[in-house]
Amino acid sequence: IWELKKDVYVVELDWYPDAPGEMVVLTCDTPEEDGITWTLDQSSEVLGSGKTLTIQVKEFGDAGQYTCHKGGEVLSHSLLLLHKKEDGIWSTDILKDQKEPKNKTFLRCEAKNYSGRFTCWWLTTISTDLTFSVKSSRGSSDPQGVTCGAATLSAERVRGDNKEYEYSVECQEDSACPAAEESLPIEVMVDAVHKLKYENYTSSFFIRDIIKPDPPKNLQLKPLKNSRQVEVSWEYPDTWSTPHSYFSLTFCVQVQGKSKREKKDRVFTDKTSATVICRKNASISVRAQDRYYSSSWSEWASVPCS
Amino acid sequence: RNLPVATPDPGMFPCLHHSQNLLRAVSNMLQKARQTLEFYPCTSEEIDHEDITKDKTSTVEACLPLELTKNESCLNSRETSFITNGSCLASRKTSFMMALCLSSIYEDLKMYQVEFKTMNAKLLMDPKRQIFLDQNMLAVIDELMQALNFNSETVPQKSSLEEPDFYKTKIKLCILLHAFRIRAVTIDRVMSYLNAS
């Protein structure tokens, strides 16, 4: 058993049929010694008396809010949560496996630049009685500070018969140099509590590996005289690290119709303009990627050919 | 320590081409190592990230773009003295700061070159003959060093009398390649910045 936060404790249980469970001793936070009784949740049934209560925690029915009282007055609470371990593996029931970039990916994180600011998100089908808390650091043995905000519900989607909820959190490394060469990864830890179930999820990464620039901005087309070619120009996104001559991007320019199966024109360039063949009912799209360290491409920025 | 903006005339920057070749060569070598040593811990997640130049050179700080010198997190620079007679910029306007940056890059390359050559000598003794260093990568390191054209003491190649542990050598190769790739990215950024200034 360990303390998650004040008056909230996590009991780690090996979860299998007829498991013996864990013996837990609760102590009432009071100077009083006599006349103390214990109850669980809203029940008025007295579970025991005395300053300490010993219980055998085996299942969710044994978890919950234990309260010690004296003469009708509440002295203190202890909330017990369960953390299940099945076949030596901690349960991951609360969050959905996003399977990208590999299986057992519950947390996904992205950074728009090298400033040390990043966003992580996760998915769940649970809509109520759900809380998250996020901690992060650079390195684990001698951790350096990363400050994370509160996790918020950022999107709701319908997937077949189920509703899916996306939560996200923004974090900022306390003293980040965009030009630094990372040798210690960022660690992100998410505590998830659903009703009386506790789970924790972690992710470890270098900012350089989760870079995904914003799409290029200000796409403009200039038809070339006596030609079917069009000069398309754009600018670096505002959110990208500066100076751009140091933090350079490379671009992919594509002309395609509405269907992905349609024919296309595609060219890669390090410049902020390119010449392509425009077709009726097609769009010109441009996306960006770090020129020197190939992490993710940005989303497309698009303009119609016409 | 930072790069001032007053720099060379356009087209006078032969190092940019060499640095691009360097990044390409080390990336290819790292990819080859990951594929060949698939049953060794050779991915970014599996290895310890060591920097053999730590406390010996300070390329990131010495080559910091002027725009980032206002960022206090970038300025915990280590004091290191460097030779300052580089010819890569082919311009008399080469400032002291820039020479410091380029000589730091030169020292990085020299240290990695020695490590890689020592390691290759060990790998050539491996009866499995599983992996060797790409001669192209070694040649590209040499070309960039020549373009930088700093005079510095030659570091003797480390020779070891004991029987090499090939497993450890291959893991060290992965660690070195990952670190060198990251440094090659920095070098490419620096050269691009100087070329544009």
Partner: antibody, heavy 118, light 107 residues
Framework: QVQLVQSGAEVKKPGSSVKVSCKAS????????LHWVRQAPGQGLEWMGW????????EYAPKFQGRVTITADESTSTAYMELSSLRSEDTAVYYC???????????WGQGTLVTVSS | DIVMTQSPLSLPVTPGEPASISCRAS??????LHWYQQKPGQAPRLLIY???QSISGVPSRFSGSGSGTDFTLTISSLQPEDFATYYC?????????FGQGTKVEIK
């Protein structure tokens, strides 16, 4: 299976014209860009131009501009390349080729040898 | 026009040995570079597109690398069926241009 079948070999006199055909099968004709590339005996590949059969748009290499005409007939899934004012150095194998991507080629015809000789 | 220069023009290789062909562009072309194989009396066949992207059905011993002006096609272990002429082609701008070809011959 996408296939491009070209017309047979031709022998032409200098100053005349040649029209080579290329019939496509497998896939929708207008879903692909069609290119013409030639190869002189023992020499390398030389790109001549492309056509978008959907709208008839064409682009020619400056070297052939004014001498080459590429057309397409959607109803028969056939493309044509006509080269005029032939000279002996136009002796080559002419390939039609296609791809959904405009700038490189993934399916080639078998080639048509055009010999220009007096 | 962008001029593509291949080297060497002839490459004698022992079967089972690796081979590398270089292609240089007269100006920077990013990764707009494609490789083809041509055997005598046959049409060319696409091997690699956009410098390093492999084609399904092409053996994994063929790999491409490079960007900017310098590109390499590598065959990790030459098989008897790989003896052919190899061409690079740039697609950075029109007109599309090819290298002059490299003939890989049995040593």
């Amino acid at each position: 299976q996408v296939q491009l079948v070209q017309s047979g070999a031709e022998v032409k006199k200098p100053g005349s014209s040649v029209k080579v055909s290329c019939k496509a099968s497998g896939g929708t004709f207008s879903d692909y860009y069609l290119h013409w590339v030639r190869q002189a005996p023992g020499q390398g590949l030389e790109w001549m131009g492309w056509i978008d059969p959907e709208n008839g748009d064409t682009e020619y290499a400056p070297k052939f501009q004014g001498r080459v005409t590429i057309t397409a007939d959607e109803s028969t899934s056939t493309a044509y390349m006509e080269l005029s004012s032939l000279r002996s150095e136009d002796t080559a194998v002419y390939y039609c080729a296609r791809n959904k991507e405009l700038r490189y080629i993934d399916v080639w015809g078998q080639g048509t040898l055009v010999t220009v000789s007096s | 026009d962008i001029v593509m220069t291949q080297s060497p023009l002839s490459l004698p290789v022992t079967p089972g040995e690796p081979a590398s062909i270089s292609c240089r562009a007269s100006q920077s072309i990013s990764i707009n570079l494609h490789w083809y194989q041509q055997k005598p009396g046959q049409a060319p066949r696409l091997l690699i597109y956009f410098a390093s992207q492999s084609i399904s059905g092409v053996p994994s011993r063929f790999s491409g690398s490079g960007s900017g002006t310098d590109f390499t096609l590598t065959i990790s272990s030459l098989q008897p069926e790989d003896f052919a002429t190899y061409y690079c082609q740039q697609s950075n701008s029109f007109p599309l241009t090819f290298g002059q070809g490299t003939k890989v011959e049995i040593k």
